[in-house]
């Protein structure tokens, strides 16, 4: 028994081939012997039952001539999945035509960290499938009648290919993904004592509309407990503040992408954000992490003081130099203190191997006064 | 072509009342984010007030919150600015705007006055 | 509210001339920053938006640049039509404020 796989909507075509490669009397039959078409002998197809009842059913006369008569099956349906017999020269041959319907839950447009089930239902009783869909960028996902995709990302959007095997026999399929989500899962930004900060949100996908609601969350370092920074409408792509904290004073803007401007990095806020994004029509809501690090030098008495807070990795590394001598190294990543220091310019650095990520410079005077 | 016609303007007193019109043409008005921008006399420009596309979402200045309303009738491809408790301060001649697509003023209409004087 | 800062407030040039106004913005505004031209007795034309996007039918010379808090806006060979009152204008957030405007003269 031939195996032909389809997929519901489609067309499959039934193989029926003559040993002898030219015209000859053939007829297609349900296992039911219902007749569905054939040619009896004047190279004209002939259909069974009414025209409404077979209108799907065809052939490909072209091919006639080769000694190749078949089935073809459009807008196939579930119930399609069945035997079909081919009767020609004395003998029958048998096609099994699978019929499968691929089904998408939740859907094709997600959202960035959700998941992708992707369902084969047919009404046969097959042996287990094999499914594996294929990116453009060469990521593979593989199952049998049900396919799972955990924690998309981003850049798993666009065409995939798939294929179905059963018996060896294939049958192809694409979907296309939407995978809405920010470009970036997380920032980090570092800023001196009194300079402005700016939070952009970036989203990785275009659309013509886009609604929703957000809201900032900030967990500063030295606060017990989050608070909302600012909540905000997103209609057909415009911003509008709904409600913003009296400290800090965040200025919003008014257009994609997300963008939020604090007036100073000022120690007490030091510390990450977690801006949300619910987008109308989506069940879940799109994150993105903002990490702020501030950096502080004083002096106070008789010493200087280097400081940042926020969250920096134990890998970054605190110096507090004056200009050609020898750095004092922190011991803890966070502070450098220097007793007496001398009178000049001295430079703070906070650095990762051999990048700085921010540095701020203090005149020691004499007299004890300083300026940044 | 597109085109902003304001009208509506004259001569009240102060704590009188102003409704300002402007007609807008040429392009899907419903579609578009409107203002209205002010211009006292010999002095610089100053925005007044801007309601979203077929939103409504409204946004006013400091300056004219709680005495002016902005609206928009999509049907009559008509934006709206009623004024009221109207002071001296509020004479200028007054601009209505079409937005872009990036939500800039990029239509200007080409004015009418308000003279609010006892 | 959002403060910007034009300058010079006016100034003198001939026709050929290279002219060049800047305007300041008393935070970051990305380029969410337009420059319209108004004539005397006219209603302003909308030359330039995010910064350096020239509006349909505004003529090459004209062009923008800046990001954040400093925005120019230069003429590169000044014609007799360009005499005018330039204004910088932020779109970042509302209220939106202009600058006080650059009155350009003839020398």
């Known amino acids: 028994k031939t195996l032909v796989l389809g997929k519901e909507g489609e067309s499959a075509e039934l193989p029926c081939e003559s040993s002898q490669k030219k015209i000859t009397v053939f007829t297609w039959k349900f296992s039911d012997q219902r007749k569905i078409l054939g040619q009896h002998g004047k190279g004209v197809l002939i259909r069974g039952g009414s025209p409404s009842q077979f209108d799907r059913f065809d052939s490909k006369k072209g091919a006639w001539e080769k000694g190749s008569f078949p089935l073809i099956i459009n807008k196939l349906k579930m119930e399609d999945s069945q035997t079909y017999i081919c009767e020609l020269e004395n003998r029958k041959e048998e096609v099994e035509l699978w019929v499968f319907k691929v089904t998408f839950s939740p859907g094709t447009s997600l959202l960035q960290g959700q998941s992708l089930t992707l369902t084969l239902d047919s009404n046969s009783k097959v042996s287990n499938p094999l499914t594996e869909c294929k990116h453009k960028k060469g990521k593979v996902v593989s199952g049998s009648k049900v396919l799972s995709m955990s924690n998309l990302r981003v850049q798993d959007s666009d065409f995939w290919n798939c294929t179905v095997t059963l018996d060896q026999k294939k049958n192809w399929f694409g979907m296309t993904l939407s995978v809405l989500g920010f470009q970036k899962a997380s920032s980090i930004v570092y800023k001196k004592e009194g300079e402005q900060v700016e939070f952009s949100f970036p989203l990785a996908f275009t659309v013509e509309k886009l609604t929703g609601s957000g809201e900032l969350w900030w967990q500063a370092e030295r606060a017990s407990s989050s608070k909302s920074w600012i909540t905000f409408d997103l209609k057909n792509k415009e911003v509008s503040v709904k409600r913003v904290t009296q400290d800090p004073k965040l200025q919003m803007g008014k257009k994609l992408p997300l963008h939020l401007t604090l007036p100073q990095a000022l120690p007490q806020y030091a510390g990450s954000g977690n801006l949300t994004l619910a987008l109308e029509a989506k069940t879940g809501k799109l994150h993105q992490e903002v990490n702020l690090v501030v950096m502080k030098v004083a002096q106070l008495n008789n010493t200087l003081t280097c400081e940042v807070m926020g969250p920096t990795s134990p890998k970054m590394r605190l110096t507090l130099k004056q200009e050609n001598q020898e750095a004092r190294v922190s011991e803890e990543q966070k502070v450098v203190q220097v007793v007496a220091p001398e009178t000049g310019l001295w430079q703070c650095l906070l650095s990762e191997g051999d990048k700085v990520k921010m540095d701020s410079r203090i005149q020691v005077l004499s007299r004890g006064v300083n300026q940044t | 072509e597109v085109q902003l016609l304001e009208s509506g303007g004259g001569l009240v007193q102060p704590g009188g009342s102003l409704r300002l019109s402007c007609a807008a043409s040429?392009?899907?008005?419903?579609?578009?984010?409107m203002s209205w921008v002010r211009q006292a006399p010999g002095k610089g420009l100053e925005w007044v007030s801007t309601?979203?596309?077929?939103?409504?979402?409204?946004y006013y200045a400091d300056s004219v919150k709680g005495r002016f309303t902005i609206s928009r009738d999509n049907s009559k491809n008509t934006l709206y600015l009623q004024m009221n408790s109207l002071r001296a301060e509020d004479t200028a001649v007054y601009y209505c705007?079409?937005?872009?697509?990036?939500?800039?003023?990029?239509?200007w209409g080409k004015g009418t006055t308000v003279t609010v004087s006892s | 509210a959002i403060q910007m800062t034009q300058s010079p407030s006016s100034l003198s040039a001939s026709v050929g001339d290279r002219v060049t106004i800047t305007c300041r913005a008393s935070?970051?505004?990305?380029?969410?920053l337009g420059w319209c031209q108004q004539k005397p007795g006219k209603a302003p034309k909308f030359l330039i938006y995010a910064a350096s996007t020239l509006q349909s039918g505004v003529p090459s010379r004209f062009s923008g640049s800046g990001y954040g808090t400093d925005f120019t806006l230069t003429i590169s060979s000044l014609q007799p039509e360009d005499f005018a009152t330039y204004y910088c204008?932020?779109?970042?957030?509302?209220?939106?404020?202009f600058g006080q405007g650059t009155k350009v003269e003839i020398k």
């Open positions: 309601i979203s596309d077929n939103i409504g979402n409204t």
């Open positions: 705007t079409k937005d872009n697509e990036d939500y800039y003023m990029d239509v």
């Open positions: 040429g392009f899907t008005f419903s579609t578009y984010a």
């Open positions: 935070q970051g505004i990305r380029n969410d």
């Open positions: 204008l932020q779109d970042y957030n509302y209220p939106r404020t």
